[in-house]
């Protein structure tokens, strides 16, 4: 039975040209995390595999940095980076847990972080 929950940074804002950390955290389970995928709806940004380490998609190599931890840092943000980002935790023996983050990249200098929230 899957008992875990994914906590994410929820809805977040950042300034154009700046950087942001996408972070998910799996809690309430003793399952072993073996891989984490970072994705958008139609493309994969990065994979962190326990055995193979990090893989960053060539499309994002210049602007994406692995970490901190299992998170992902997006740099040199543009308004086109606005949208949904998904963390997909592959675990043993539970299976997969997924979380959603919505990033809004703002033109102005008023960019506030949204509240943290949980996805069961």
């Amino acid at each position: 039975m899957m008992t875990g929950t994914i906590e994410t940074t929820g809805n977040i804002s950042a300034e154009k040209g700046g950087s942001i950390i996408l972070q998910c955290h799996l809690s309430s389970t003793t399952a072993q995390v073996t891989q984490v995928n970072w994705e958008q709806q139609d493309q994969l940004l990065a994979i962190c595999n326990a055995d193979l380490g990090w893989h960053i998609s060539p499309s994002f190599k210049d602007r994406v940095a692995p970490g901190p931890g299992l998170g992902l840092t997006l740099q040199s943000l543009t308004v086109n980076d606005t949208g949904e980002y998904f963390c997909i935790y592959h675990t043993y023996p539970d299976g997969t847990y997924t979380g959603r983050i919505f990033l809004e990249v703002l033109e102005s200098s008023v960019a506030e972080h949204g509240a943290r929230f949980q996805i069961p």
Partner: antibody, heavy 121, light 107 residues
Framework: QVQLQQSGAEVKKPGASVKVSCKAS????????IEWVKQAPGQGLEWIGV????????NYNEKFKGRATITADKSTSTAYMELSSLRSEDTAVYFC??????????????WGQGTTVTVSA | DIVMTQSPSSLSASVGDRVTITCKAS??????VAWYQQKPGKAPKLLIY???YRYSGVPSRFSGSGSGTDFTLTISSLQPEDFATYYC?????????FGQGTKVEIK
């Protein structure tokens, strides 16, 4: 349990259009992406496109852009794939499929039974 | 588009045999590969996702491995119900693409 029920077989003339439906049940329709896949007779699988039923946003294989239109009706939990300007090479079985996890990667865990479309003069 | 090339295109095997099907991607797809089984007149069934993760309810005789460009589906001891066509698929980028299929037939 999750079910994707597709509409029945269609026979169409070249140049016509066909609209295939895929009615979802057993889960929250707006939370999961729906994909469409083509399989020509004796051939492999070819991805057509995807829709997010919650937002209506979609993405297409370039090969089908302009001829395929994928839509979703939240009120009936039904996804549609319309193919226009039909030609003989569109004769195929068309499947709808759902990703395995909410927000999940594009592996397809649940499939409709398939709809056979025959294009013949 | 990423091209997925499967081999062999068909093979003959007996019940109890160990069967290996390979899939080669035209570019690095990390571990973003799924495997499906399809029987005539039926929809495909998901066996493996992310190269090596067995989907819920799939028998343990099915296993997947590989990363980068080379991937393998192994059936450790072929059962009568395993005679079917198997497809690999990359879930790395759009458009999603499939291998051409490997038909596993009874020897």
């Amino acid at each position: 349990q999750v079910q994707l029920q597709q509409s029945g077989a269609e026979v169409k003339k070249p140049g016509a259009s066909v609209k295939v439906s895929c009615k979802a049940s057993g889960y929250a329709f707006t939370n999961y992406l729906i994909e469409w896949v083509k399989q020509a007779p004796g051939q492999g699988l070819e991805w057509i496109g995807v829709i997010n039923p919650g937002s209506g946003g979609n993405n297409y294989n370039e090969k089908f852009k302009g001829r395929a239109t994928i839509t979703a009706d939240k009120s009936t939990s039904t996804a549609y794939m319309e193919l226009s300007s039909l030609r003989s090479e569109d004769t195929a079985v068309y499947f709808c499929a759902r990703r395995g996890d909410k927000y999940g990667s594009a592996w397809f865990a649940y499939w409709g039974q398939g709809t056979t479309v025959t294009v013949s003069a | 588009d990423i091209v997925m090339t499967q081999s062999p295109s068909s093979l003959s095997a007996s019940v109890g045999d160990r069967v290996t099907i390979t899939c080669k991607a035209s570019q690095d797809v990390s571990t973003a590969v799924a495997w499906y089984q399809q029987k005539p007149g039926k929809a495909p069934k998901l066996l493996i996702y992310s190269a090596s993760y067995r989907y819920s309810g799939v028998p343990s005789r099915f296993s997947g491995s590989g990363s980068g460009t080379d991937f393998t589906l192994t059936i450790s001891s072929l059962q009568p119900e395993d005679f079917a066509t198997y497809y690999c698929q990359q879930h790395y980028s759009s458009p999603r693409t499939f291998g051409q299929g490997t038909k596993v037939e009874i020897k």
